[in-house]
């Protein structure tokens, strides 16, 4: 083994290095001392370190470690944070466009329905946005509410324009009839299936991204144990006590220390890998009815089809509803 | 009385969604994100090595510090902790993860379960399985648009796949992130608390 270089007879170099860490020189001995009170940088001979310096080194070592960890995760953190924000905004844009398309469809094809239809469409898409953001709303209920609200207007404005506007009594009956008679055919069920599947996937996708941010934030701000602090101090700073200012830790030794310090963090690895692969699988499946962009931007067309279906079956429906809701209508005409 | 089919499609306005030079859809954006995330798949297992390579370690020097003394870089002593008896590395590993790490692992397990459930072929209706489940991008004449309204000029044209990025206030390329492409790595510019 090569002999160590002679220690700094005056601890002058150590003092000038230590001063950068801790202005004020009172902790650095003038000349090497026995260092019997040291707990980490146990000396083999005289040392230029004091107990106070050792504590400062430990603090600095843990701080260095935290900074290194944060710089290691910076790019990953930025990637997920940016994407989570962009996707959330993009999904809101999709919802806004879907609402506009649906309103435009009503305005162009069914102008007599517009004031009320706009209101119902607006409520529906507000619920869609809330659902994506994690609100506890049932998608089937949202779709049912949309069709329940639309049908009385379609019935009174398109199918039976002779009815007075104050059809509050008949409205309740019509809402009930809408489901019992499957007035819109299988379109509501179709929309429920498509919307619930695509929104569920979208919501989980956003949740997963947000959890990704939480994972990085958690590991980013880990506080390292005292034991780890001692090992880091010994690796990075104990050489200074011997006046070996320019010496660096051995690579293998660094790896051993880091594995020890990060044993807990590394346990995340298995689940992190699975997270990325599961997210990839989800993304690969986000097409057709699992793609909210596709589903929501096509909703106006399916709603249009559903109204056409009602209109084309208007004769049969009007007769059946006339019988079913006759009581409500009579009360109303009185 | 029935609703007469004279001309259902009155409005002559054409609604066009954002024109974007680089036509980018949500699905391409998602795939791009996954590709970038996959480059971080070993992030946690590689952390110890990453931190060592970004903190001062002896690379070209003949001698290096093993925690206790100066040794030759390739000697057996170089990889060993010079002060084995002071406290045990193995013990440190055995302590297990911190409570916050255990908590985040539980959350990861839960989301992974959810993600798997959503991606399960079993949990999915095969595209054409149900009468009512088929759904693809629409069409409008020859140009892959969907139309609101009927034929002729009374329709509203809609881009079927939103070219959404044009509407976002910022571009998302991680490569262009501040301090990202030319990020000064601690290797070149050590964190100020290292004095070498």
């Amino acid at each position: 083994q090569p002999p160590p270089p002679p220690p700094d007879a005056t601890c002058h170099q150590v003092r000038s290095f230590f001063q950068r860490l801790q202005p004020g020189l009172k902790w650095v001995p003038e000349t090497p001392v026995p260092g019997s009170d040291l707990q980490v940088c146990l000396p083999k001979g005289p040392t230029c370190c004091s107990r106070k310096m050792e504590e400062k080194y430990q603090l600095t070592a843990r701080l260095n470690m935290e900074q290194l960890l944060q710089s290691a995760s910076m790019e990953l953190k930025f990637l997920i944070i940016q994407n989570a924000a962009v996707f959330q905004e993009a999904f809101e844009i999709v919802v806004r466009h879907a609402k506009n398309y649906t309103n435009a469809m009503f305005k162009n094809n069914y102008p007599s329905l517009t004031p009320q239809a706009f209101e119902f469409v607006g409520e529906f898409f507000t619920d869609v946005s809330l659902y994506i953001l994690g609100s506890d709303i049932n998608v089937d209920d949202m779709v049912n509410e949309l069709f329940d609200s639309l049908f009385p207007v379609i019935y009174t404005q398109l199918m039976n324009p002779g009815l007075p506007d104050s059809a509050l009594d008949i409205n309740e009956c019509l809402r009930g009839a809408r489901r019992d008679l499957k007035v819109f055919g299988n379109f509501p069920k179709l929309i429920m299936t498509q919307v619930s599947k695509s929104l569920q996937v979208t919501r989980i996708f956003l949740q997963a991204l947000n959890l990704g941010i939480e994972v990085i934030n958690t590991t980013d701000h880990l506080k390292f144990s005292k034991d780890c602090g001692r090992m880091l101090t010994r690796m990075w700073y104990c050489s200074y006590c011997q006046g070996l200012m320019m010496v660096k830790p051995c690579g293998g030794y660094c790896n051993v220390v880091m594995q020890g310090c990060m044993a807990g963090v590394v346990e995340i690895d298995k689940y992190w890998r699975e997270y990325i692969l599961s997210l990839e699988e989800l993304v690969n499946g986000m097409y057709r009815i699992y793609d909210m962009e596709n589903v929501l931007l096509g909703l106006f067309s399916t709603i249009h089809d559903s109204i056409q279906y009602v209109q084309k079956n208007a004769g049969k429906l009007t007769t059946t509803i006339g019988k079913l809701c006759a009581h409500s209508q009579q009360r109303q005409y009185r | 009385s029935a609703y007469y089919p004279e001309d259902l499609f009155i409005d002559k306005k054409v609604l066009k969604v954002a024109h974007v030079e680089h036509e980018e859809t949500l699905s391409s954006r998602r795939r791009e994100l996954i590709q970038k995330l996959k480059s971080f798949i070993s992030f946690y297992s590689a952390l110890p090595g990453y931190i060592c390579s970004h903190s001062p370690v002896a690379e070209n020097d003949t001698l290096c510090w093993n925690g206790q003394e100066l040794v030759e870089r390739y000697s057996q002593k170089a990889a060993r902790n010079g002060m084995k008896n002071q406290f045990n590395l193995h013990e440190l590993k055995m302590k297990g993860p911190e409570p916050v790490v255990s908590q985040i692992i539980d959350k990861l397990k839960h989301i992974n379960q959810l993600l798997r459930t959503m991606s399960m072929p079993k949990g999915r209706v095969l595209d054409k399985n149900l009468d009512e489940e088929g759904f693809e991008s629409g069409d409008c004449g020859d140009d892959e648009d969907e139309c609101i309204g009927g034929s002729g000029d009374g329709m509203i044209k809609v881009k079927n796949q939103l070219r959404f990025l044009a509407e976002l206030a910022y571009d998302l390329d991680v490569d262009d992130a501040p301090g990202n492409s030319q990020q000064a790595t601690p290797k070149d510019n050590e964190i100020s608390t290292f004095h070498n």
């Epitope: 399916t302 079956n313 429906l317 007769t319 | 029935a2 259902l8 009512e132």
Partner: antibody, heavy 119, light 107 residues
């Protein structure tokens, strides 16, 4: 102008299946339902069912459930009808027709496809 | 399903004459009825919907009337191109049904 172009005549063995096509042009395919109608030579017309191309939602005459399957391909603006387990009773001319959008009356018809089932 | 009964099954007439074809339904369908003309080897052509509204491009010599269960199609001053088969169809709701047809022949 609106046109519905149907595929050519089919000769099939009993028990076999045939798939007829109806290519639409001159209008937005996804904005209207397409119905299929059967006409046995020299006889009346029978409504088989309809498909809404956008959502591929289908509605059948009970009599033809299990016999006919309606599908649509939006990319080619084509509607299809598959007839399976063919018997001599399925020998007929089959028409596709487009309705007005809000009334079940058919303003536009394909030229018809003759299906002959014979051993 | 709604039954459609057309009469007569066939009739002969000359150019210039006026003819009436009738259609009876098994239940009240209000005005939800359409009439079609079909020539040999061709597809049907819509003449009338909603019992009395003429489809686009249909000559005014054709007229539809009736409501409830009784409907008729009247052709004034028959033209050579008017000969062929005529079908009624209700558009009251699915399933749609057609009459058996009336064959109009040149006398």
């Amino acid at each position: 102008q609106v046109q519905l172009q149907q595929s050519g005549a089919e000769l099939a063995r009993p028990g076999a299946s045939v798939k007829l096509s109806c290519k639409a042009s001159g209008y937005t395919f996804t904005s209207y339902g397409i119905s299929w109608v059967k006409q046995i030579t020299g006889q009346g017309l029978e409504w088989i069912g309809e498909i809404y191309p956008r959502s591929e939602s289908t509605y059948y005459n009970e009599k033809f459930k299990g016999k006919a399957t309606l599908t649509a391909d939006k990319s080619s603006s084509t509607a299809y009808m598959e007839l399976r387990s063919l018997t001599s009773e399925d020998s007929a001319v089959y028409f596709c027709a487009r309705d007005y959008g809000n009334i079940y009356s058919f303003a536009y018809w394909g030229q018809g496809t003759l299906v002959t089932v014979s051993a | 399903d709604i039954q459609m009964t057309q009469s007569p099954a066939s009739l002969s007439a000359s150019v210039g004459e006026t003819v009436t074809i009738t259609c009876r339904t098994s239940e009240n369908i209000y005005s939800y009825l359409a009439w079609y003309q079909q020539k040999q080897g061709k597809s049907p052509q819509l003449l009338v919907y909603n019992a009395k509204t003429l489809a686009e491009g249909v000559p005014s010599r054709f007229s539809g009337s009736g409501s409830g269960t009784q409907f008729s199609l009247k052709i004034n001053s028959l033209q050579p191109e008017d000969f062929g088969s005529y079908y009624c169809q209700h558009h009251y709701g699915t399933p749609l049904t057609f009459g058996a047809g009336t064959k109009l022949e040149l006398k």
